[in-house]
Structures are given as structure tokens and as C-alpha cells.
Amino acid sequence: MHSDCIFKKEQAMCLEKIQRANELMGFNDSSPGCPGMWDNITCWKPAHVGEMVLVSCPELFRIFNPDQVWETETIGESDFGDSNSLDLSDMGVVSRNCTEDGWSEPFPHYFDACGFDEYESETGDQDYYYLS
């Protein structure tokens, strides 16, 4: 399958997951915290202020970096996998903090954690898709 198709499919699945997570967590438009988000690379679950969310490098990265085997679970509720399966020190794990200002930037850079550069420039325009 073409990588663009995989991205579109992942994005659609992500938005569905976020919607279900919102229902489970009781999130709505006026809820404090950070809405779930598809950042063109991976899916981020809704989070409360002060929460650090961890995700593993997406399956897609195996196309670009087939020698690297990554965990496939992400942290969080329901569709977002098992929080015990990821560790802060794990390779192939990216985190964001939910702050009062919204989501922090990912740490580390996707290129370092996953072996593939998501943007030519790390400060370029980024089309994030939120669902709250």
C-alpha cells in the first residue's frame, strides 16, 4: 500500500479513536486540557493538563526503517493501548506534555526516536487535526 494511503487510513482511525476516548473520558469543547490530535505522524489521545502522553513510533516507520522493530502500543485509555508497555527511556517512544498552553512539541524529535524525518525543517508549517 502506498505510504500516502497508509497515512490517510491512520488519520481516519485516529480521529475515530479520539472520539471514543472523548466519550470515555468525558471530554468536550469546554473541557480543560488538550484535545486528541493527529499530527501527521501519529495519534495523540486527549489529555489533562499536567499529563505526559507517550506513544511509540507508528507502524508506518517500518516502511522507512524496516530494520528497526518498535513497540506498537501507545499510552492511554481503550484504543490507545496499555500504559504499562511504554517506558520513558524506551527507544522509539515519543512524548508530549499537556500544558495550560496546549500540547508541547514532541520529545525527542521524530527523526531521532523513529529514524525518519517528519519535516524538512522542524519549524515548518504543521497541519494538526484536533478533535474535541
Partner: antibody, heavy 118, light 108 residues
């Protein structure tokens, strides 16, 4: 208390290679990014480059052709090599690490003065 | 390369006064990627502020950071004798990671 310590020759001849090592002492620490930064006397800070724990590197374009960084197998030390040095490379060299999941250097070495002179 | 320009170059103030230091970026920098450090003579820099506005552990609350986009500010609400030093901003968003040229806060 965990500390970083830079070590290496304080005097290097022009055209030779400057070699420095940064060692973690006083405990162990898992670092994400290891960096080298230098500061000529009375001047500002210049970022030389960094290496991620996986080994991926990124160097300042102004020095890229002369710089090599590596992490020791025990991951408690990392090194800097700067080739073809000139007097302009005379500076205090600092190692610094990102040990937390955040974009900041949370631990710095005390710095070591390297003089390039014949 | 993102150029960080700090102003003023030198700030001459008395203890007890308020210091306002500016850091202007040549391109947009996400708040997450902006940090401030303090450096005293003969010492390594020390982290003050990360994420543009979060104080590092052990940093007194007289230090505060603000700003977004291309304009960032470090404020010291009431200068103490030990605060006089050189202050640097730094960005991690785009390679090469860069520092501002520094602002020296000296005793008037």
C-alpha cells in the same frame, strides 16, 4: 550528585585534531541528547553539535566537515573530535546533556579550556 | 539557521530593580523549544527557564519567562546581588540549535 566532567589536552597544535571526552561521575544517568558547546574568551556560546542516544548525530554546519561525536559503549561518556584546528578554535569547551524529557540542557560540565597554539 | 538576537547587549541596574531582557528569533520558534540560561564568570551556564515560561528546579520565582512566536522575554522582578551575570536564550526547534549572543546584567 551526578556531574559531567570534560577531559582532554589543554593545548593542541594548529592543523592537529582536538579530542575531548565527557564523563558522567557521581552516579549514572540516562541521557537522551549529548551536546558539545564552546565559548571563546569573552564571547558567547556556540553549539557544536549533538548526538542522540541511538547514535544519530547533528552538527553545526559551520563546523560539520571537521566534527565527529560518539557515545561510549557504557553510555556514561561521549567524545568530541575536531580536526584541522586553528587559533579560532581556542575556547572553553562544555559538554551538556538533555537527561529529562524536555527541550533544555539540564546538566552541564564545568568546561575545559583548549588552546590552539604552536 | 534561526538567529536569536538579544537586547539590550548590556543592562546596568541596581539591586532591587526590575530587569527585562528580550530575545527575538529570525523565524517562529515554538514555546516548547525556547530556554534561558544564566552564566557567571568562570562558570558553566545554568538553566533558568524552559518551554519559554517554566522555571527550572530551584530557580526563585523572581525569574519569569514569557512570549511566543518570535519574541520572548526574561524578567527578573527584583534584582538580587547574585543575579548579576550574562543571560542567554537558546532554541531547540531547528538545527543548528542556536544561542543568542547574550545580555549582560551589570551593577549600576
Amino acid at each position: 550528585q551526578v556531574q559531567l566532567q570534560e577531559s582532554g589536552p589543554g593545548l593542541v597544535k594548529p592543523s592537529e585534531t582536538l579530542s575531548l571526552t565527557c564523563t558522567v561521575s557521581g552516579g549514572s544517568i540516562s541521557s537522551y541528547y549529548w551536546s558539545w558547546i564552546r565559548q571563546p574568551a569573552g564571547k558567547g556560546l556556540e553549539w557544536i553539535g549533538r548526538i542522540y542516544t541511538s547514535g544519530s548525530t547533528n552538527y553545526n554546519p559551520s563546523l560539520k566537515s571537521r566534527v565527529t561525536m560518539s557515545i561510549g559503549t557504557s553510555k556514561n561518556q561521549f567524545s568530541l573530535k575536531l580536526s584541522s584546528v586553528t587559533a579560532a578554535d581556542t575556547a572553553v569547551y562544555y559538554c551538556a546533556i538533555i537527561a529529562s524529557r524536555g527541550w533544555y540542557f539540564d546538566l552541564w560540565g564545568r568546561g575545559t579550556l583548549v588552546t590552539v597554539s604552536s | 539557521e534561526i538567529v536569536l538576537t538579544q537586547s539590550p547587549g548590556t543592562l546596568s541596574l541596581s539591586p532591587g530593580e526590575r530587569a527585562t531582557l528580550s530575545c527575538r528569533a529570525s523565524q517562529t520558534v515554538s514555546r516548547s523549544y525556547l530556554a534561558w540560561y544564566q552564566q557567571k564568570p568562570g562558570q558553566a551556564p545554568r538553566l533558568l527557564i524552559y518551554g519559554a515560561s517554566s522555571r527550572a528546579t530551584g530557580i526563585p520565582d523572581r525569574f519569569s519567562g514569557s512570549g511566543s512566536g518570535t519574541d520572548f522575554t526574561l524578567t527578573i522582578s527584583r534584582l538580587e546581588p547574585e543575579d548579576f551575570a550574562v543571560f542567554y536564550c537558546q532554541q531547540f526547534g531547528s538545527s543548528p540549535w542556536t544561542f543568542g549572543q547574550g545580555t549582560k546584567v551589570e551593577i549600576k
